[in-house]
């Protein structure tokens, strides 16, 4: 069951794994839930103890039965880790700790003209983990305004102390704020022959990548697979850092992949989710549990409703015995990682789906694209809403994109002329216009927020957010689409598309069902040239065909130009403006979500 | 050990400008801050100016604003302090003195290692 | 700026015997203040920080005290070797400032 509350003064005795030390509980609570095994833990505060080296301690606790006893005690704060729950998990901490210091290696020392500067500092710096700002109130001189850049081994502080005029805090890069680059690339028949910071089993890269990404040290790793010369290091993931962040030397080697830490990218990849199944391979590990389940989807599902299952094998039912079901052996280990990987058994091997929670939700795959005709088909762009406006009579207004649980992006311009959102509609999961009916429901808009340096659709700044007054239940047919990574800044995007049920051409009417065109990207210049009169800013990003025929139009603004990537669909643009609809020459004009990225956070994070 | 060895004696016009340099060898050059302080025939210490030789950052005294110019080589270890528009009034020692650990938040200090001295004779 | 003031200019004592030296700031400085010792023809060396902390190889016989304006150098037994110069300087605001520094002579 899932226990969001903290218990105050309240200890749970036994069943420590680690210690960790941690700004506040509300901090250790989240380290608690992206640890393997963590169930529950304890977090002594300043007034628990006498002894100042106890102070912020987060000891990590796990049970059998996922309880533990409790123990009176003045200054400690309990609780259970969210992995019993079903929300969204977010490893983001924005939180300022004042007159606290976080210990860790301190390896880099500057001034910076606020700690919100010095944040930003250590979020675009490869190495750090967080940081201390010592204030210019701090008593020594020299030191004032000085921002520490640290890390340590395992991403947490080694210590924290009190000390007076100084403010600490985490590392961004998990909240979608680095501008630190992203090399989405796995590059095969490589070795990078750098120090290893730990190393786990893995059945691919790819799970391999996901570890490293989820690893505090690891910047980079080598992946052995299963042909691999070596039988002792098959399958072996491992995990690497250097003092530049870049591999010192790339060896080739045959049956070996490496690639990078997508740190810097998280919110828009799967990093805890391994939602693939493998063949033929069995997961070794202690045993939680053996239950015969029919089918290996069963399997999986059972591991994660199981709390403590990391992992399973499921080994298929020999013939027609026991009624065609098989045995499900539940898993787990340390670190959440096979400790051995076997091929060749017959087995289906996989992991829990319980951590794809602390993934976005937008990363989820979706249903494959309906390749050909330009109707979208229901649940093909989850994220795609519509406006509706109630005044004078109700009539759609504009498209909007799903980008989290209570937020709709869209554009500026869609509000000219409307007073207040009290007349404002959002429709989401629909496919066509005429399912709306009177008592269809729909989410109220609580606030408008437009970009205050928005004029017009023409000179940039066409974006706004509406913030809804009922939080959103993800389904199939309903999702957040995520936004850009800044960190794939030089990303070229070649699967685009643009949907809305906007006119087909420039005197038409609001089409029935949703619909969609594959549109390739424009660069900037090539786009400038189109629109001599205009001035197309880096805030901006063009798409169209040369010939024209296909592209956004009236009804379409606000809603989103979509494109895939990695398996993963983002929000590359907003439906602004252009000269007519799918002329020739003439490509359709886009707000550049990425450029917005930091204004979308500020707001919806506030 | 830790030491500062700072470049040999100038002889220099009015007008001119004059560039010493200050090695520092014993420790990680790029932990700690660098001052400059320079001291007149027969006078007392004036301080001129702070390098904080990690970020190259600098802070000098508004006497020497516009004059002074401080500046590091982390391959080298070296910090650099460049006075134009000499006039006979800057005739001095010039001294390189270490700063605070700027890797840990101490609260006092003081300048725990000085360079021998560099002797600037500025005249016609 | 902090104008630091050292008295007096000199001080003649004898060797064995204690030395008091005095440094006032022209507003308060808490704790910022450092004193050097500068013999001819040699740099300055750090004898105090912190306005009493003991550097690093200095004998006990030297002790700062004081806080805010008024300081104190105090040389408890004056021995040959610690005839020379002193200055106080404040760490506590920019620009640095020293004081003129007190000359301590064999009477």
């Known amino acids: 069951e899932c226990v969001t509350r903290l218990f105050k003064d309240i200890h749970f005795e036994g069943g420590d794994i680690a210690t960790v030390f941690t700004p506040s509980a509300k901090h250790c609570q989240v380290v608690c839930t992206h640890h393997p095994r963590c169930l529950l833990f304890t977090f002594t505060g300043e007034s628990a103890s006498e002894d100042p080296t106890q102070w912020f301690t987060c000891v990590l606790k796990d049970s059998v039965t996922e309880t533990l006893p409790r123990v009176n005690r003045t200054g400690a704060i309990s609780g259970y880790s969210f992995k019993q729950c079903s929300h969204q998990i977010s490893a983001c901490n924005k939180d300022i700790y004042v007159d606290l210091d976080m210990k860790g290696i301190n390896y880099n020392s500057s001034l910076a003209k606020s700690a919100q500067e010095c944040q930003e500092r250590c979020t675009d710096d490869i190495h750090c983990h967080f940081f201390t700002y010592a204030t210019r109130q701090f008593p020594s001189l020299e030191h004032r305004n000085i921002c520490l850049l640290k890390h340590t081994q395992t991403g947490t502080p080694t210590g924290i102390m009190k000390l007076d005029k100084v403010v600490t805090g985490f590392s961004l890069k998990s909240c979608a704020l680095s501008n630190l680059a992203c090399i989405r690339d796995v590059f095969p028949n490589t070795v990078f022959a750098d120090s290893n910071i730990d190393s786990v089993m893995a059945p691919d890269a790819f799970v391999c990548r996901r570890i490293c990404t989820h690893h505090p040290g690891c910047l980079f790793f080598t992946f052995f697979s299963q042909e691999w010369p070596k039988e002792s290091q098959r399958n072996l993931c491992l995990l690497k850092t250097s003092e530049s962040g870049l591999p010192s030397t790339r060896i080739k080697k045959s049956k070996a992949l490496s690639g990078f830490s997508l740190q810097s990218c998280r919110h828009s990849i799967p990093v805890f989710c391994h939602s693939s199944f493998y063949h033929d391979t069995d997961f070794l590990g202690e045993e939680l549990d053996i239950v015969a389940v029919k089918g290996h989807e069963a399997c999986q599902k059972l591991c994660t409703n199981a709390v403590r299952c990391q992992f399973f094998t499921y080994a298929p039912a020999q013939a027609s015995c026991n009624e065609g079901k098989g045995k499900c052996y539940l898993k787990l280990s340390s670190n959440g990682s096979p400790t051995k990987i076997l091929r060749g058994t017959g087995g289906i091997s996989g992991y829990t789906l319980r951590l794809c929670k602390m993934d976005n939700e937008c990363t989820t795959k979706i249903k494959p694209r309906i390749v050909g005709g330009t109707a979208s088909v229901r649940g093909e762009w989850p994220w795609q809403v519509t406006l509706h406006t109630t005044s004078p009579t109700q009539r759609h207004l504009c498209g909007g994109s799903i980008i989290g649980n209570q937020w709709i992006l869209t554009a500026a311009h869609c509000f000219y002329g409307v007073e207040s959102p009290k007349i404002l509609r959002v429709y989401i999961g629909i496919l066509n216009q005429s399912e709306i009916k009177e008592d269809t429901s729909f989410f109220g808009v609580q606030e408008i927020i437009i970009h205050d340096q928005y004029k017009m659709a023409e000179s940039g700044y066409d974006i706004a957010l509406l913030k809804l007054e009922t939080t959103v239940n993800y389904t199939d047919s309903q999702r957040p689409i995520c936004l850009p990574s800044k960190g794939d800044r030089n990303v070229i995007y070649t699967d685009c598309w643009v949907t809305g049920w906007g006119y087909r051409k420039l005197r038409d009417k609001i089409q029935n069902t949703l619909q969609k065109a594959k549109i390739p990207l424009v660069t900037n210049d090539e786009c400038q040239k189109r629109y001599r009169g205009h001035k197309i800013t880096h805030k901006m990003i063009c798409a169209g065909y040369r010939e024209g025929g296909k592209d956004a139009c009236k009804g379409d603004s606000g809603g989103p130009l979509s494109c895939k990537h990695n398996e993963v669909w983002h929000l590359v643009g907003i439906t602004s403006w252009g000269e007519g609809c799918a002329q020739r020459e003439r490509p359709g004009v886009y707000t550049n979500v990425l450029e917005y990225v930091d204004w979308i956070l500020e707001k919806t994070q506030a | 050990q830790v030491q500062l060895v700072q470049s040999g004696a100038e002889v220099k016009k009015p007008g001119a400008s004059v560039k010493v340099s200050c090695k520092a060898s014993?420790?990680?050059?790029?932990?700690?801050?660098m001052h400059w302080v320079r001291q007149a025939p027969g006078q007392g210490l004036e301080w001129m100016g702070i390098i904080n030789p990690s970020g190259g950052s600098t802070s000098y005294a508004q006497k020497f604003q516009g004059r002074v110019t401080m500046t590091r080589d982390t391959s080298t270890s070296t910090v650099y302090m460049e006075l134009s528009s000499l006039r006979s009034e800057d005739t001095a020692v010039y001294y390189c003195?270490?700063?605070?650990?700027?890797?840990?938040?101490?609260?006092?200090?003081?300048?725990?290692?000085w360079g021998q001295g560099t002797t600037v004779t500025v005249s016609s | 700026e902090i104008v630091m003031t050292q008295s007096p200019a000199t001080l003649s004592v004898s060797p064995g015997e204690r030395a008091t030296l005095s440094c006032r700031a022209s507003?308060?400085?808490?704790?910022?203040l450092a004193w050097y010792q500068q013999k001819p023809g040699q740099a300055p060396r750090l004898l105090i920080y912190?306005?009493?902390t003991r550097a690093t190889g200095i004998p006990a016989r030297f002790s700062g005290s004081g806080s805010g304006t008024e300081f104190t150098l105090t040389i408890s037994s004056l021995q040959s070797e610690d005839f020379a110069v002193y200055y106080c300087q404040q760490f506590n605001d920019w620009p640095l400032t020293f004081g003129g520094g007190t000359k301590v002579e064999i009477k």
């Open positions: 912190g306005a009493s």
């Open positions: 507003q308060s400085v808490s704790s910022n």
């Open positions: 014993g420790y990680t050059f790029t932990s700690y801050s």
């Open positions: 003195a270490r700063g605070a650990y700027l890797m840990e938040l101490y609260y006092y200090y003081g300048m725990d290692v």
